[in-house]
């Protein structure tokens, strides 16, 4: 049977917590990604940003999980209007910001 959306979001939160807690060296060698608008379409926007990071095993599971939340196909180089114009941040900061936002969505019961 399909995993309930609440459980899938909890899994994603757990993975982001693990990434932030287990981080020793700079995450993804300090790679920079586009900052995104967290107010709407967060899963696809986050995937569009993170998919441009290659060769970073630490976020591969996160990329797969976000893919499960995003209803359309996302490929590298693709950017929606949800990206914050011309603002790049380190992957580590991106993950922290995303985690805070997703935890709030979970606490509010907003799983879709």
């Amino acid at each position: 049977s399909p995993v309930p959306r609440s459980t899938a979001l909890k899994e994603l939160i757990e993975e982001l917590v693990n990434i932030t807690q287990n981080q020793k060296a700079p995450l993804c060698n300090g790679s920079m990604v586009w900052s995104i608008n967290l107010t709407a379409g967060v899963y696809c926007a986050a995937l569009e940003s993170l998919i441009n990071v290659s060769g970073c095993s630490a976020i591969e599971k996160t990329q797969r999980m976000l893919n499960g939340f995003c209803p359309h196909k996302v490929s590298a180089g693709q950017f929606s209007s949800l990206r914050v114009r011309d603002t790049k941040i380190e992957v580590a900061q991106f993950v922290k910001d995303l985690l805070v936002h997703l935890k709030k969505l979970f606490r509010e019961g907003r799983f879709n």
Epitope: V3, P4, S6
Partner: antibody, heavy 123, light 107 residues
Framework: EVTLRESGPGLVKPTQTLTLTCTLY??????????VDWIRQPPGKGLEWLAH???????RYNPALKSRLTISKDTSKNQVVLKLTSVDPVDTATYYC???????????????WGQGTLVTVSS | DIQMTQSPSSLSASVGDRVTISCRAS??????LNWYQQKPGKAPKLLIF???KLHSGVPSRFSGSGSGTDYTLTISSLQPEDIATYYC?????????FGGGTKVEIK
């Protein structure tokens, strides 16, 4: 030391609104990751979760009672208030408040409980 | 809502016995399972959270295990002060739900 103390009317008439207050000691609901739950227990029966409020005012309710419940907080008094409208004798129970702390994963584990306040609904 | 089913509803054991209480969830709760002890006339107390983590001050004779939908609370050597009703609770997501309780008595 973390302590929670419930206060309530003891006796309420059917159709009235029950107002319960939980006063928090040893921690503040203005601190990130803190939450407070209300749980009730009818005499001789099990535990039923009612509502939850987080430090940032995010609230969740038991769907079976949502239309009758309101949870709120007064950070300046370090209190959480629960209101239950249109009470009925089946609402007779001991009402507990309890603390939840959520650091890292969101656990929803109630680590400290108040002593409870017995509320009887009767005319 | 996630339903929690506890068994047995009551049990009687001798001092020093190993006691196990089971809890089953209606769906996978990913180890977000908590156990509480309630003595007569008192408020519940947290014993174990996240399946197996002991709350501060809880004796080491209490332990928890399980995964997916099935969880167990074990008292390795029952003591007279362990007479109480024990409740499991899923902490995955609201509405938070409790098992029906297991009353533990001494033979």
């Amino acid at each position: 030391e973390v302590t929670l103390r419930e206060s309530g009317p003891g006796l309420v008439k059917p159709t009235q609104t029950l107002t319960l207050t939980c006063t928090l000691y040893g921690f503040s609901l203005s601190t990130s990751d803190m939450g407070v739950d209300w749980i009730r227990q009818p005499p001789g029966k099990g535990l039923e979760w009612l509502a939850h409020i987080w430090w940032d005012d995010v609230k969740r309710y038991n769907p079976a009672l949502k239309s009758r419940l309101t949870i709120s907080k007064d950070t300046s008094k370090n209190q959480v208030v629960l209101k239950l409208t249109s009470v009925d004798p089946v609402d007779t129970a001991t009402y507990y408040c309890a603390r939840t702390v959520s650091s890292g994963y969101i656990y929803y584990a109630m680590d400290y409980w108040g002593q409870g306040t017995l509320v009887t609904v009767s005319s | 809502d996630i339903q929690m089913t506890q068994s047995p509803s009551s049990l009687s054991a001798s001092v020093g016995d190993r006691v196990t209480i089971s809890c089953r969830a209606s769906q996978d709760i990913r180890n977000y399972l908590n156990w509480y002890q309630q003595k007569p006339g008192k408020a519940p107390k947290l014993l174990i959270f996240y399946t197996s983590k002991l709350h501060s001050g809880v004796p080491s004779r209490f332990s928890g295990s399980g995964s997916g939908t099935d969880y167990t609370l074990t008292i390795s050597s029952l003591q007279p002060e362990d007479i109480a009703t024990y409740y499991c609770q899923q902490g995955l997501t609201p509405p938070l739900t409790f098992g029906g309780g297991t009353k533990v008595e001494i033979k």
